[in-house]
C-alpha cells in the first residue's frame, strides 16, 4: 500500500448536456513528485483535458480549489458538457523528469455518458 495508487472510484458517470461533469481521482501518496494530467481516451491519440502543471483549460475546475481540504484529491469538473464530450477519461500521474516528465501510473478510467438536455 506504500506505492502510489491512482484511484478513479467510479467506472461510469452520467450527466445531462449543458451541465458540468465531475470526474473523481485520488492519489494514495504524494511521492513521486510530478504533475497530474487528465486525458480523454488512451494511447497515442488521447486528448489532453487538464494539466496540473501548465496550460489554460477554461472549462475545467479542480474540485480541490473549492474544498481546500487536501492535496490528494485531483477530481475535476468539466463545464458545459455536450455529447461530443462522451468517452473514457483517465487521471494520470507523471513523475518529474528532465527534460520531460514521464508517465508513472494511470487510473482505471471513468466512462462519461451524456444524457439529452432535460426539456
Amino acid at each position: 500500500e506504500d506505492e502510489l495508487q491512482v484511484i478513479q472510484p467510479e467506472k461510469s458517470v452520467s450527466v445531462a448536456a449543458g451541465e458540468s461533469a465531475t470526474l473523481r481521482c485520488a492519489m494514495t501518496s504524494l511521492i513521486p513528485v510530478g504533475p497530474i494530467m487528465w486525458f480523454r481516451g488512451a494511447g497515442a491519440g488521447r486528448e489532453l483535458i487538464y494539466n496540473q502543471k501548465e496550460g489554460h483549460f477554461p472549462r475545467v475546475t479542480t474540485v480541490s480549489e473549492l474544498t481546500k481540504r487536501n492535496n490528494l484529491d485531483f477530481s475535476i469538473s468539466i463545464s458545459n458538457i455536450t455529447p461530443a464530450d462522451a468517452g473514457t477519461y483517465y487521471c494520470v500521474k507523471f513523475r518529474k523528469g528532465s527534460p520531460d516528465d514521464v508517465e508513472f501510473k494511470s487510473g482505471a478510467g471513468t466512462e462519461l455518458s451524456v444524457r439529452a438536455k432535460p426539456s
Epitope: E1, S14, S20, T28, L66, R69, S75
Partner: antibody, heavy 121, light 108 residues
Framework: QVQLQESGPGLVKPSQTLSLTCTVS??????????WSWIRQHPGKGLEWIGY???????VYNPSLKSRVTISVDTSKNQFSLKLSSVTAADTAVYYC?????????????WGQGTLVTVSS | EIVLTQSPGTLSLSPGERATLSCRAS???????LAWYQQKPGQAPRLLIY???SRATGIPDRFSGSGSGTDFTLTISRLEPEDFAVYYC?????????FGGGTKVENQ
C-alpha cells in the same frame, strides 16, 4: 451544522414510482467537493448504497438499481431527490440521505434520520 | 464490486470488556477509503472512523481503527453501556460503495 431531512410518502403501490426528497439545512448543497447520496436499509438487514449526485448534476448509480433510479438536484431549494421506478415489495426499506466528502479520506456524515417506505397494495 | 465481510456476526460481551471487530475486503482497499459506522435501533448510522484509523469529531478515544489492504479492525477498548449496537464497515475505493453485513455487539 449541516442537517439532512428526508420526506415523501411512506406507502407506495407496487409497479409505481417511489419519490423522496432530502432537504439540506445549515449549509449549501452547492458547496464544492460534497457528494449527496441515497442509501437504503431493508428491515432488519444491512445498508445498500443507491447512488449520488454532485451539485453540478453528475450522477453515479449502483449498477444493481441503475435501470430504475434517477437522482436529481435543485440547488435553489437546497434539495436533492430520489425516484425509483417499478417498485416491488423488495424495495420496502428505510431510505437515508447522506453527505459524502469533501476530498479524501472520504466518509458519509451527516445522515438524515431515515424514512420508512413500504411497498404494498 | 468489492465485498466486505464482517466477523463475528454477533459479539456477546459485558461492559468494561474489549471488543474487536473484523472487516475483510474481497480486494485490497487503500486505508483512505475505509470507514466504520455505529447504528442503534431506530437510528441512522453514525460515523465513527474514517480513513481506516481517524476518529470522527466527538467520538471517544476508546474507539480505534486499524488495518490495511484487505484486513481492517475496529476496537472498542472498554465497552460502555451505550456502545451496544451494530457496527458497519464501508468502502469508497470502487463504485458501487459497499457496506459490510454488520457486527452486532450485545450485552452478555
Amino acid at each position: 451544522q449541516v442537517q439532512l431531512q428526508e420526506s415523501g410518502p411512506g406507502l407506495v403501490k407496487p409497479s409505481q414510482t417511489l419519490s423522496l426528497t432530502c432537504t439540506v439545512s445549515g449549509g449549501s448543497i452547492s458547496s464544492g467537493g460534497y457528494y449527496w447520496s441515497w442509501i437504503r436499509q431493508h428491515p432488519g438487514k444491512g445498508l445498500e448504497w443507491i447512488g449520488y449526485i454532485y451539485y453540478s448534476g453528475s450522477t453515479v448509480y449502483n449498477p444493481s438499481l441503475k435501470s430504475r433510479v434517477t437522482i436529481s438536484v435543485d440547488t435553489s431549494k437546497n434539495q436533492f431527490s430520489l425516484k425509483l421506478s417499478s417498485v416491488t415489495a423488495a424495495d420496502t426499506a428505510v431510505y437515508y440521505c447522506a453527505r459524502e466528502g469533501p476530498g479524501y479520506p472520504s466518509y458519509f456524515d451527516p445522515w438524515g434520520q431515515g424514512t420508512l417506505v413500504t411497498v404494498s397494495s | 464490486e468489492i465485498v466486505l465481510t464482517q466477523s463475528p456476526g454477533t459479539l456477546s460481551l459485558s461492559p468494561g470488556e474489549r471488543a474487536t471487530l473484523s472487516c475483510r475486503a474481497s480486494q485490497s482497499v487503500s486505508s483512505s477509503f475505509l470507514a466504520w459506522y455505529q447504528q442503534k435501533p431506530g437510528q441512522a448510522p453514525r460515523l465513527l472512523i474514517y480513513g481506516a484509523s481517524s476518529r470522527a469529531t466527538g467520538i471517544p478515544d476508546r474507539f480505534s481503527g486499524s488495518g490495511s489492504g484487505t484486513d481492517f479492525t475496529l476496537t472498542i477498548s472498554r465497552l460502555e453501556p451505550e456502545d451496544f449496537a451494530v457496527y458497519y464497515c464501508q468502502q469508497f475505493l470502487s463504485s458501487p460503495w459497499t457496506f459490510g453485513g454488520g457486527t452486532k455487539v450485545e450485552n452478555q
